[in-house]
């Protein structure tokens, strides 16, 4: 007999608003395999069960986060495979302040990523870049996390802000700095970047 799950990963990241199908199938040497998903919240996707297979459709809602388990059996032999589903939100919605930097001033620059999920400092990281390198000497102030105002009911999204105190930008000043925000998920790294021009 063979037991297969497609995609085969034990952790799957799904962008909010996108759908994903996880197909669990099993074939038996004799007879028809029994395959089903368990550990499902009522809200976690929909299941279509066919002879020898079961398809879990995840709708890409934040409530779809969970760890369903596919169980397949041939007679007295059974196999199982769990899939940790993480639904994330990371739109390219970075806002920087100020809109431009003035050389020779002691200033604070902020970078806000809007409509984020999960709002976990371990998943989301901010960097202030000069070219492709972190800006040497910038001092990171404490990050802020606030709930976004939602038009509809549902699991809330967050905005996360990082501020830095800038070192002297030198002479001549660089044309721009960049705020880079990275979301690190299982087997997936996403990055957005926003320019902060420097007045010349």
């Amino acid at each position: 007999q063979s037991f297969q799950v497609n995609p085969p990963e034990s952790e799957v990241a799904v962008a909010m608003g996108t759908s994903l199908q996880i197909t669990c199938s099993m074939s038996c040497d004799e007879g028809v395999a029994r395959v089903h998903w368990r550990g499902l919240d009522t809200s976690l996707g929909s299941v279509q069960t066919l002879p020898g297979s079961s398809i879990l459709s995840v709708r890409g809602m934040l409530s779809d986060t969970g760890t369903p388990v596919c169980v397949g059996s041939c007679g007295s032999r059974s196999f199982q495979h769990s899939v940790k589903i993480l639904v994330y939100a990371f739109p390219d919605q970075l806002v920087v302040s100020p809109e431009f930097l003035v050389p020779g001033q002691d200033q604070v620059v902020s970078c806000t990523a809007h409509n984020i999920w999960p709002a976990d400092p371990n998943s989301l990281s901010f960097a202030l870049l000069l070219g492709e390198q972190r800006l040497e000497g910038a001092q990171a102030l404490e990050p802020e996390q606030e709930e976004e105002i939602q038009e509809a009911e549902g699991t809330p999204l967050f905005r996360m802000t990082q501020r830095w105190r800038l070192p002297s930008l030198g002479t001549p000043a660089p044309p721009a700095l960049h705020c880079q925000v990275t979301m690190q998920l299982p087997k997936l790294v996403l990055t957005h970047r926003k320019e902060i021009p420097v007045l010349q």
Epitope: G137, Q139, L141, L166
Partner: antibody
Framework: EVQLLESGGGLVQPGGSLRLSCAAS????????MHWVRQAPGKGLEWISY????????NYADSVKGRFTISRDNSKNTLYLQMNSLRAEDTAVYYC????????????WGKGTTVTVSS | DIQMTQSPSSLSASVGDRVTITCRAS??????LAWYQQKPGKAPKLLIY???SLQSGVPSRFSGSGSGTDFTLTISSLQPEDFATYYC?????????FGQGTKVEIK
């Protein structure tokens, strides 16, 4: 000469309040971010709060958040720390310190003022 | 928060000795590290900033080195006035944090 001088320490009962002051002289006070750092008897240094030159940014260590408030009066060249709901573990010498623009280390410290919280 | 760990926590040395104190950060602080000296009943005094820059007025027998997570304060020839407690501090990100201190005592 650049100087910082703290005052306002003393003995206070648990749950009580105290306001510390730090008088600055010898530099343009409003140009500098300022800090409070404390040191419990026989212990190391613990940063507790900062305030930016224009008071637009403040922050606190978790150990004092919600109980202490930092403020400044640039016209008087004075930094303040309002301490409420004091606990025995707040007993310490409290120092104010200036931080260096563009570099951010604490380059000038006051002599400290002692706060004792005891019944 | 970034943890700063100093070693040793105390040491005994004689006048003229070369003394080395190390400081390790739990994550990279680049070169955003300062060293302070504190004598009993006194305020801390800045010795070194940006990991290796000597503060104005501090004797040249004090030097700092390192970057990232590992830093060293060296006193090339210990003088009687150097017996004190030394603290490292990272100011890369808030909350700024100090090492637990290294007490340098007379042997």
């Amino acid at each position: 000469e650049v100087q910082l001088l703290e005052s306002g320490g003393g003995l206070v009962q648990p749950g009580g309040s105290l306001r510390l002051s730090c008088a600055a002289s010898g530099f343009t006070f409003s140009d500098f971010w300022m800090h409070w750092v404390r040191q419990a008897p026989g212990k190391g240094l613990e940063w507790i709060s900062y305030i930016s030159g224009d008071s637009g940014y403040t922050n606190y260590a978790d150990s004092v958040k919600g109980r202490f408030t930092i403020s400044r009066d640039n016209s008087k060249n004075t930094l303040y720390l309002q301490m409420n709901s004091l606990r025995a573990e707040d007993t310490a010498v409290y120092y104010c310190a200036r931080d260096r623009p563009y570099y951010y280390y604490m380059d000038v410290w006051g002599k400290g003022t002692t706060v004792t919280v005891s019944s | 928060d970034i943890q700063m760990t100093q070693s040793p926590s105390s040491l005994s040395a004689s006048v003229g000795d070369r003394v080395t104190i190390t400081c390790r950060a739990s994550q990279s602080v680049s070169r955003s590290l300062a060293w302070y000296q504190q004598k009993p009943g006194k305020a801390p005094k800045l010795l070194i900033y940006a990991a290796s820059s000597l503060q104005s007025g501090v004797p040249s027998r004090f030097s700092g080195s390192g970057s990232g997570t590992d830093f060293t304060l060296t006193i090339s020839s210990l003088q009687p006035e150097d017996f004190a407690t030394y603290y490292c501090q990272q100011y890369k990100s808030y909350p700024v944090t100090f090492g637990q201190g290294t007490k340098v005592e007379i042997k």
